[in-house]
């Protein structure tokens, strides 16, 4: 059974992941990003189901495409450090989903834009956090 300290650690890691995903989304939405239109043409795979930490496998598998899109989006008005940012996110995802069990991700038939993709995983984090608190 999860201890209160492990639950707290999980909550903090989810909050970390949530904040990093929100930072990317805010950057895409709120700044004069000349490459936004092009960014929205890239398609991301969405999880068929995302209700448990093991489902983060589906996010992990899409982190490389996310890094590539963020690299393409770099401009004077949209500056992130995609390699470091995705590396930070990857570390948290690996810790959260664990490596004990191998989970095969199932994807939905419909693909999504980067905005829809980020919103989906932000909602996932918020949902899990709410069950922990």
């Amino acid at each position: 059974a999860p201890t209160s300290s492990s639950t707290k650690k999980t909550q903090l890691q989810l909050e970390h992941l949530l904040l990093d995903l929100q930072m990317i989304l805010n950057g895409i939405n709120n700044y004069k990003n000349p490459k936004l239109t092009r960014m929205l043409t890239f398609k991301f795979y969405m999880p068929k189901k995302a209700t448990e930490l093991k489902h983060l496998q589906c996010l992990e598998e899409e982190l490389k495409p996310l890094e590539e899109v963020l690299n393409l989006a770099q401009s004077k008005n949209f500056h992130l450090r995609p390699r470091d940012l995705i590396s930070n996110i990857n570390v948290i995802v690996l810790e959260l989903k664990g490596s004990e069990t191998t989970f095969m991700c199932e994807y939905a038939d419909e693909t999504a834009t980067i905005v829809e993709f980020l919103n989906r995983w932000i909602t996932f984090c918020q949902s899990i956090i709410s069950t922990l608190t």
């Epitope: 970390h16 990093d20 950057g27 004077k76 949209f78 995609p82």
Partner: antibody, heavy 121, light 110 residues
């Protein structure tokens, strides 16, 4: 008005770990939109970026210092900290903390007053 | 990685105009914003120009920044020089991996 203040020991022995804290007042580290940075200036020399942290805890470092640098954040105290391991005399410098925008580009404003750290036995 | 090269020192008389250059060694100067910081002796740096040509509130309009893609350099121009402008000036830019400062230029107001 946002203010930053560095604090920590002014003298560190070679091979030990340098530890500094930056206390932010007049604004919240958790408000988002900014990274929290460390920069240093060797005596009589130019400026060198060390790294920065987002309030989520995500770190970004100068590639040349990455292996020795740890930056952490304590949102409850409105502070962020720098640890630099295995220091040598070459790490003697004035260390500054500063605020950096997250998406519109890496620049620094405002800066703390700076604290001189000397590495000597 | 790229470097930013500035003249070691410049000097000019009060009331005159001075320009400090900052040349990027590789990659386009226009690809990322350039900032300029003023550092008076014994003080921490303060921003005089950010995002190529923007002035923070409180910085007089005697200070201006520009970018020249043909020479791959940025410039800080100070007009109507005053003795209080005597300081070290640093340019700064970045890429997706690093933040880079110029070596600094000592401005002497004669």
């Amino acid at each position: 008005q946002l203010q930053l203040q560095e604090s920590g020991p002014g003298l560190v022995k070679p091979s030990q770990t340098l530890s500094l804290t930056c206390t932010v007042s007049g604004g919240s580290i958790s408000s988002g939109g900014y990274y929290w940075s460390w920069i240093r200036q060797h005596p009589g020399k130019g400026l060198e970026w060390i790294g920065y942290i987002y309030y989520s805890g995500s770190n970004y470092w100068n590639p040349s210092l990455k292996s020795r640098v740890t930056i952490s954040v304590d949102t409850s105290k409105n502070q962020f900290s720098l640890k630099l391991s295995s220091v040598t005399a070459a790490d003697t410098a004035v260390y500054y903390c500063a605020r950096t925008p997250t998406v519109t580009g890496d620049w620094f404003d405002p800066w703390g007053r700076g604290t001189l750290v000397t590495v000597s036995s | 990685n790229f470097m930013l090269t500035q003249p070691h020192s410049v000097s000019e008389s009060p009331g005159k105009t001075v320009t400090i250059s900052c040349t990027r060694s590789s990659g386009s100067i226009a690809s990322n914003y350039v900032q300029w910081y003023q550092q008076r002796p014994g003080s921490s740096p303060t921003t005089v120009i950010y995002e190529d040509n923007q002035r923070p509130s409180g910085v007089p309009d005697r200070f201006s920044g520009s970018i020249d893609s043909s020479s791959n350099s940025a410039s800080l121009t100070i007009s109507g020089l005053k003795t209080e402008d005597e300081a070290d000036y640093y340019c700064q830019s970045y890429d997706t991996r690093d933040v880079v400062f110029g070596g600094g230029t000592k401005l002497t107001v004669l």
